[in-house]
Structure formats: structure tokens, C-alpha cells
């Protein structure tokens, strides 16, 4: 099968990280540099992709596989792929058109990327605020305040929440 | 190998909004980043703007305010909406695999032209 | 924005012999990474753009060599080592270092 393959279309032999060369009667050439081929019997290779201005490269190119990219220092990135990179921001912020802006009073941002998001609403599960919310954490909500009747037992305050993990940039 | 085709209306009436589909085949949109260019008659060629396959964009500041660029991955195409169309917006508009977000335009539609016309 | 400014806007060439043709940017396109963010493109008559150099100088697959490219920083060279009656056509060159890419106004190679 791979000889019949090969005589209907020379093409198919070259492996990935070369491609079928039409100027030189469709011998597999390698790529050239900054290029690569992921897959065999490509008639041209893909020029690598490019990390420049706010992004840096966090895999370089080879000829069989593309380049990836990350973002600097200062910088997180965005969509599939890092296609964009973004400005950072403190906790207890968040990224607007004007620039980084202090969450609004009731919101939180934990995080340096992200929107401000608002203070958990204690009372709706029928609990009080035990910690009070910034704009960097959210609220802490304890027992409900029948819980709280004299005789009753003293509340030990819950560990403090974790935080969520940020991945590698 | 990948192929893009544009597809669209070929006459436009002043201030109203044209709109492109570029359809790829061959592989798949999603990866890499797809660019709008345009290249009114007899002159030079204009990069109009980027869009990755999950959505991110990137247009020229020269045309920001009237660009739009989506994508439908399910379909394998994106499009472009120019909005308050004029003369001057007359051009062959190509679409182009874009290898680095503004840079190394290596797979080309065949071209169309959109005439603004009344 | 970066500006590209090209010359000779127009070269008759006799076919067999070479020719070149000059770019400019308004600023370095050398990058950190030692990479000259620089692309040339060929418009045949009724057709599509195709890219020839990318990188300055790295020849795309398929591009016959007798195209070559050269330069760095703000001053780039198209050449050409021997005319064919198939290179006619609108030679660009742009750059790709930041957006938007910008190109230069064209230099119409036509055949004596």
C-alpha cells in the first residue's frame, strides 16, 4: 500500500519536518529556518509563529512544531493559545478601558486578572457576616444568628479560605 | 493545502455596512490567526485587522471605529463587517492566514472586489 | 505607526539579468530575538499576493532561489540573481513587527 501511495504521489514519503519541493522535482526538502512541518507529505511548511512585543516565548519553534508563547512579566494571557496578552492588575482591582480602577464598595477581586465580583450575600443562606468583605476578599459568612443565642456553644471562626490557584504565566 | 475563498456582495451603497465571509479549507481555523487586507484599484495593500480562532481581535486604528471581525469555527470561516461605507472603501479585499498576528501573510484568498457605489 | 518606503517604484529588467530592489523602514525592525520582523511579497498580474522572503531573508517553500533577501534594522534588499519572464509583477515588502503591518507603495518590476 505505502509503495502504491508513494506512486500516486511522491509527496506522500516526505516525513514532517520537510516538504515536497516543486522546484526540485518533488524532492522532500528540509524546512527552511523559522519554518517547520507538523505532519508528513506537505507540500510547503508553516513559518513559525513569533513572540514579540508583549509576549515572549515560552517554547521555541523546531521544524516539525510550532512556537508557543506566553506574556511578560506584568502581563497574563488571554483566549486559546495565548492570543493576547493583558495588562495585570493589584488585587482589589480590575482591568477597565481606563486602565486598572479599585473595585467598587460590595465587589472583591482576588486575583490580578479578571473583573471585581460581589461580596457573597451572607443572609441569603439564612447566615451572618463573620468577616467583614474588601475590596480584595470576599466576605466571610458565619452561623445563622439563632445559632448565636447565649448558652450556645462559642464559634470557632472557619480556616480563611483558600486561595484560588493562579497558573503559570 | 489551505485554501481560502471570500465570498460576499460585490456592490455596496454608500453609508451602508458591507460584509465578507472567508471560508478555509484544507485545515483548520482552528490555530493560527486570520486577517482582513484590501487593496483599492491600482494601489497599495492596507492590513484591515486580525482575529484568532477563540475569538480575539486585533483591527487597524485607522478603521477601528466601523470593523467588526468574527469567527465560526464549526463553519471553518470568519467574516468582516465594515460599517458606513464610502467611495474610498472600494478595494479588493483578500483574506490571508496571518502566521504571528501581523505578520507573514503565507496563504491568500483569490481576491474580491466590493464596489461602493449608489 | 511604522513607515515602509520602497525603491525604484518601477524596474524594467531584460530577462537573464539581475535585479534588486530597495526597502526602508521608519524604524528598526530588528527584534531581541535577532529576528528581522521583514516580509516580501509578489503580486502577479490579477492574482493574489504571495509571500517570497519572510524574516529578512529566509526564503519561503517553494520560492525558487534565485530570490534572496537581505538586510537588517531599517534597510532591506529584494534581489533577484536572474530575471524570468514569470517575475513580473508589484514587489512589497512590509513589515511585521508591530501592528498594524504596514507595506511599502510597490515597486513594479516589468520586463524590456
Known amino acids: 500500500f505505502e509503495r502504491t501511495r508513494s506512486l500516486q504521489d511522491p509527496c506522500s514519503n516526505c516525513p514532517a519536518g520537510t516538504f515536497c519541493d516543486n522546484n526540485r522535482n518533488q524532492i522532500c526538502s528540509p524546512c527552511p529556518p523559522n519554518s517547520f512541518s507538523s505532519a508528513g507529505g506537505q507540500r510547503t511548511c508553516d513559518i513559525c509563529r513569533q513572540c514579540k512585543g508583549v509576549f515572549r516565548t515560552r517554547k521555541e519553534c523546531s521544524s516539525t512544531s510550532n512556537a508557543e508563547c506566553d506574556c511578560t512579566p506584568g502581563f497574563h494571557c488571554l483566549g486559546a493559545g495565548c492570543s493576547m496578552c493583558e495588562q495585570d492588575c493589584k488585587q482589589g482591582q480590575e482591568l477597565t478601558k481606563k486602565g486598572c480602577k479599585d473595585c467598587c464598595f460590595g465587589t472583591f477581586n482576588d486575583q490580578k486578572r479578571g473583573i471585581c465580583r460581589p461580596w457573597t450575600n451572607c443572609s441569603l443562606d439564612g447566615k451572618s457576616v463573620l468577616v467583614n468583605g474588601t475590596k480584595e476578599r470576599d466576605v466571610v459568612c458565619g452561623p445563622s444568628p439563632a445559632d448565636l443565642s447565649p448558652g450556645a456553644s462559642s464559634v470557632t471562626p472557619p480556616a480563611p479560605a483558600r486561595e484560588p490557584g493562579h497558573s503559570p504565566q | 493545502q489551505v485554501q481560502l475563498q471570500e465570498s460576499g456582495p460585490g456592490l455596496v451603497k454608500p453609508s451602508e455596512t458591507l460584509s465578507l465571509t472567508c471560508t478555509v479549507s484544507?485545515?483548520?481555523?482552528?490555530?493560527?490567526?486570520w486577517s482582513w487586507i484590501r487593496q483599492p484599484p491600482g494601489k497599495g495593500l492596507e492590513w484591515m485587522g486580525y482575529?484568532?480562532?477563540?475569538?480575539?481581535?486585533n483591527i487597524n486604528p485607522s478603521l477601528k471605529s466601523r470593523v467588526t471581525i468574527s469567527v465560526d469555527t464549526s463553519k471553518n470561516q470568519f467574516s468582516l463587517k465594515l460599517s458606513s461605507v464610502t467611495a474610498a472603501d472600494t478595494a479588493v479585499y483578500y483574506c490571508?492566514?496571518?502566521?504571528?498576528?501581523?505578520?507573514?501573510?503565507?496563504?491568500w484568498g483569490q481576491g474580491t472586489l466590493v464596489t461602493v457605489s449608489s | 505607526e511604522i513607515v515602509m518606503t520602497q525603491s525604484p517604484l518601477s524596474l524594467p529588467v531584460t530577462p537573464g539579468e539581475p535585479a534588486s530592489i530597495s526597502c526602508r523602514s521608519s524604524?528598526?525592525?530588528?527584534?531581541?530575538?535577532?529576528?528581522?520582523?521583514l516580509d516580501w511579497y509578489l503580486q502577479k498580474p490579477g492574482q493574489s499576493p504571495q509571500l517570497l522572503i519572510y524574516?529578512?531573508?529566509n526564503r519561503a517553500s517553494g520560492v525558487p532561489d534565485r530570490f534572496s533577501g537581505s538586510g537588517s534594522g531599517t534597510d532591506f534588499t529584494l534581489k533577484i540573481s536572474r530575471v524570468e519572464a514569470e517575475d513580473v509583477g508589484v514587489y512589497y515588502c512590509?513589515?511585521?513587527?508591530?501592528?498594524?503591518?504596514?507595506f511599502g507603495q510597490g515597486t513594479k518590476l516589468e520586463i524590456k
Open positions: 484544507g485545515g483548520s481555523i482552528s490555530s493560527y490567526y
Open positions: 490571508a492566514r496571518d502566521q504571528s498576528g501581523g505578520g507573514s501573510f503565507q496563504h
Open positions: 524574516a529578512g531573508s
Open positions: 512590509m513589515q511585521a513587527l508591530q501592528t498594524p503591518p504596514t
Open positions: 524604524q528598526s525592525l530588528l527584534y531581541s530575538n535577532a529576528y528581522n520582523h
Open positions: 482575529i484568532y480562532y477563540s475569538g480575539s481581535t
